[in-house]
Amino acid sequence: HVRHYYIAAEEIIWNYAPSGIDIFTKENLTAPGSDSAVFFEQGTTRIGGSYKKLVYREYTDASFTNRKERGPEEEHLGILGPVIWAEVGDTIRVTFHNKGAYPLSIEPIGVRFNKNNEGTYYSPNYNPQSRSVPPSASHVAPTETFTYEWTVPKEVGPTNADPVCLAKMYYSAVEPTKDIFTGLIGPMKICKKGSLHANGRQKDVDKEFYLFPTVFDENESLLLEDNIRMFTTAPDQVDKEDEDFQESNKMHSMNGFMYGNQPGLTMCKGDSVVWYLFSAGNEADVHGIYFSGNTYLWRGERRDTANLFPQTSLTLHMWPDTEGTFNVECLTTDHYTGGMKQKYTVNQCRRQSEDSTFYL
């Protein structure tokens, strides 16, 4: 069973708060004295809230001309790449096309691959003087295309003690730190055999959300110089080592959204909702993700706050029983004030049956 995805890395201008408003305070993000002003003020030596980024985006075929538009179920993904999903026993093929200006790759966490499909380059006998050419899997050059093949044996799948699906991730690993901070990361879902609908949604689950809370350190981005040139009004005066400048570029976000600007986190009262949380980053990425208004189950325990550390992931199951708009937020103090907080809404809904017939 093969799941074949067409994914390109491409440049976009990403706005961390498209409304221009702190949804929590209803204030402008650049209001004097506000927590958000330091990140969103744009000026002589400040970039502001929009940055050039590299992101993974899904296409319909190998021509990489028809980008797959994201529907309402996917808009919450934001900066993240498309969801790659598979069941135990499947093979995943990803045809990756690099539309960026740097060598890039795709490296998965949580599936199996051989050396020819590895997105990270290292020499078995490392020699700094070596001029050996990295294999194409780990350095897909600009304009080039490579097809990765990964397998999902039962050894990497969920055990009886695990949830039905495990949250995993993929990212570019040419320069992992820089590549991820540039925006090249996406979610992956690895599930028990026979647990998914034909469209990839988990059986007996109404909504699935992927959350990537992180401090996007734009100082580490491959595109920092471009952003200084594009968005500051006096780029020659920018001191990249200045602590205040650096702080202004540390974007405390979920899926690339700050201060409640993340769309699509809506569900119905009584829905079966799965939240897939995953994290990357550095020592700053220690998160306590709090869901106000409702609780979730994790390994049979009822909780409202999930602890997340770099390179870890969690699958949380929620049955929201209270209508209203609530917060999903990182309670790590400076993350909270820095904007790593969103709103989710629980509506009273009328149930409708789904038509799942397609014509080719």
Epitope: H4, A62, R93, L196, H197, A198, K203, F358
Partner: antibody
Framework: QEQLVESGGGLVQPEGSLTLTCKAS????????MCWVRQAPGKRPEWIAC???????SYFAGWAKGRFTISKTSSTTVTLQMTSLTAADTATYFC???????????????????WGPGTLVTVSS | DIVMTQTPASVEAAVGGSVTIKCQAS??????LAWYQQKPGQPPKLLIF???SLPSGVPSRFKGSGSGTQFTLTISGVQCADAATYYC????????????FGGGTEVVVK
């Protein structure tokens, strides 16, 4: 032993209707795609439709749209309802299991690892 | 739609010899190609999937190769039981393609 058996074929008048049934045994098709493929005398096989045993999602060839309906009627039975039949629909109709498939761009393609013996449908006045 | 063109339409083979059948896709289908064997009055039988993989129970004298648009089925050490019609099938599952079979190749064993 894994097996598929089709039934319901026979002679039908032009513009008539017919329902074919496929009975599976020896396996649980909740994690398989079950498909119908037809073959006119002396011609290549032609894919009609598939249904996923897990959730009933179905796919049809464009030419089958509107006239053919595929359904999972039990945990071991799949049916193909055919309407407005013409002489061009005369063929042997096979039920096939697809254990090999590819998912891409929201659609599925199937290779068929288990076939029934087929049932002949003749459309004639 | 992707069109599958099979050649030759018919081929003779001696017992113990080998036969090569070619299949061409009108567009790139990666390795999503299957080969079937069909004898008169019987349903097709899967010989190869994913262009080169053999399902369990299929003799190793059947070998599939190719990717993209050009594919080959080779039968080595031909036996009398190999007399049949062979079909290739594209199963590249995008919403723009019908999963088409090739026109078939009749193998006659002398």
């Amino acid at each position: 032993q894994e097996q598929l058996v089709e039934s319901g074929g026979g002679l039908v008048q032009p513009e008539g209707s017919l329902t074919l049934t496929c009975k599976a045994s020896g396996f649980d098709f909740s994690s398989y795609w079950m498909c119908w493929v037809r073959q006119a005398p002396g011609k290549r096989p032609e894919w009609i439709a598939c249904i996923y045993g897990g959730d009933g999602t179905s796919y049809f060839a464009g030419w089958a749209k509107g006239r053919f309906t595929i359904s999972k009627t039990s945990s071991t039975t799949v049916t193909l309802q055919m309407t407005s039949l013409t002489a061009a629909d005369t063929a042997t109709y096979f039920c096939a299991r697809a254990d090999y498939y590819v998912y891409v761009d929201g659609g599925y393609g199937h290779a068929y690892d288990l076939w029934g013996p087929g049932t002949l449908v003749t459309v004639s006045s | 739609d992707i069109v599958m063109t099979q050649t030759p339409a018919s081929v003779e083979a001696a017992v113990g010899g080998s036969v090569t059948i070619k299949c061409q896709a009108s567009d790139d289908i990666y390795s999503y190609l299957a080969w079937y064997q069909q004898k008169p009055g019987q349903p097709p039988k899967l010989l190869i999937f994913d262009a080169s993989s053999l399902p369990s129970g299929v003799p190793s004298r059947f070998k599939g190769s190719g990717s993209g648009t050009q594919f080959t089925l080779t039968i080595s050490g031909v036996q009398c039981a190999d007399a049949a019609t062979y079909y290739c099938q594209n199963y590249y599952g995008s919403s723009s393609s019908v999963h088409a079979f090739g026109g078939g190749t009749e193998v006659v064993v002398k």
